[in-house]
């Protein structure tokens, strides 16, 4: 089948890194500078991706493969193949229409990207706050208040689950 196809279409013999040049009797010509073909039998070469501005070159373009970009320090990749670069913020901040802004009280972000998220509501799980939250860190929930009452021991069976919205008396 391959031989039949090559007799019918001389372009199928052109390897990656070349293109089938219709202007030269379908001779396989090398891809021009700053272009590539990653598969054989192509009639044109694709233009290499250029990494500009906040994009920097992670892998140079070759005659058979496209360039790959990542983001300059201070930015991180978004999208397939790093199609976008988004500015980092500090922990405890999020990127808004006015740039990096501190998380509002009651929210936190422990990464340089993403949005501020609300602190965990310990009472929903019948627990108490062991360590207060900050802009950079979520609260740490501890044992339920009932577990902390005097005389309670580790062998005490767990308290029955409370309905949501009801706090311990």
């Amino acid at each position: 089948f391959e031989r039949t196809r090559s007799l019918q279409d001389p372009c199928s013999n052109c390897p990656a890194g070349t293109f089938c040049d219709n202007n030269r009797n379908q001779i396989c010509s090398p891809c021009p500078p700053n272009s590539f073909s990653s598969a054989g039998g192509q009639r044109t070469c694709d233009i290499c991706r250029q990494c500009k501005g906040v994009f920097r070159t992670r892998k140079e373009c070759s005659s058979t493969s496209n360039a790959e970009c990542d983001c300059t320090p201070g930015f991180h990749c978004l999208g397939a193949g790093c199609s976008m670069c988004e500015q980092d913020c500090k922990q405890g901040q999020e990127l808004t229409k006015k740039g990096c802004k501190d998380c509002c009280f009651g929210t936190f972000n422990d990464q340089k990207r993403g949005i501020c998220r609300p602190w965990t509501n310990c009472s929903l799980d019948g627990k108490s706050v062991l360590v207060n939250g900050t802009k950079e860190r979520d609260v740490v929930c501890g044992p339920s208040p009932a577990d902390l009452s005097p005389g309670a021991s580790s062998v005490t069976p767990p308290a029955p689950a409370r309905e949501p919205g009801h706090s311990p008396q």
């Epitope: 500009k52 978004l78 670069c85």
Partner: nanobody, 122 residues
């Protein structure tokens, strides 16, 4: 061919002013959002300011009230008026298209200028 050419950089004393220009050709400027970014020596790239095609503007907190971004669609030019300059404003300033319309986010298809050096020193 798309071109963005910045000019207007230079050496200025603290408290002084400069006006950067970015002349654009090769695409429809009037419908394009534009932005300025900067990179100080040994520091990371930083988004500075952006302007929608409508003229709506955004600024990073550190330059708000001191820098003004504007555009002249008749001249295919975007400007950055910088006043009350500080030594920490020293950087190479870059003009770029802004296709994402998201502050601090650039797309791989955005175009960038070569940059103009701004030095604030006494």
């Amino acid at each position: 061919e798309v071109q963005l050419v910045e000019s207007g950089g230079g050496l200025v004393q603290p408290g002084g002013s400069l006006r950067l220009s970015c002349a654009v050709s090769g695409f429809t400027f009037s419908s394009s959002a534009m932005s300025w970014a900067r990179q100080a020596p040994g520091k990371e790239f930083e988004w500075v300011s952006s302007i929608y095609s409508s003229g709506k503007t955004y600024y990073v907190e550190s330059v708000k009230g001191r820098f003004t971004i504007s555009r002249d669609n008749a001249k295919n030019t975007v400007y950055l008026q910088m006043s009350s300059l500080r030594p920490e404003d020293t950087a190479v300033y870059y003009c770029a298209t802004w296709k994402t319309l998201r502050v601090g986010v650039w797309d791989e298809s955005d175009y960038w200028g070569q940059g103009t050096q701004v030095t604030v020193s006494s």
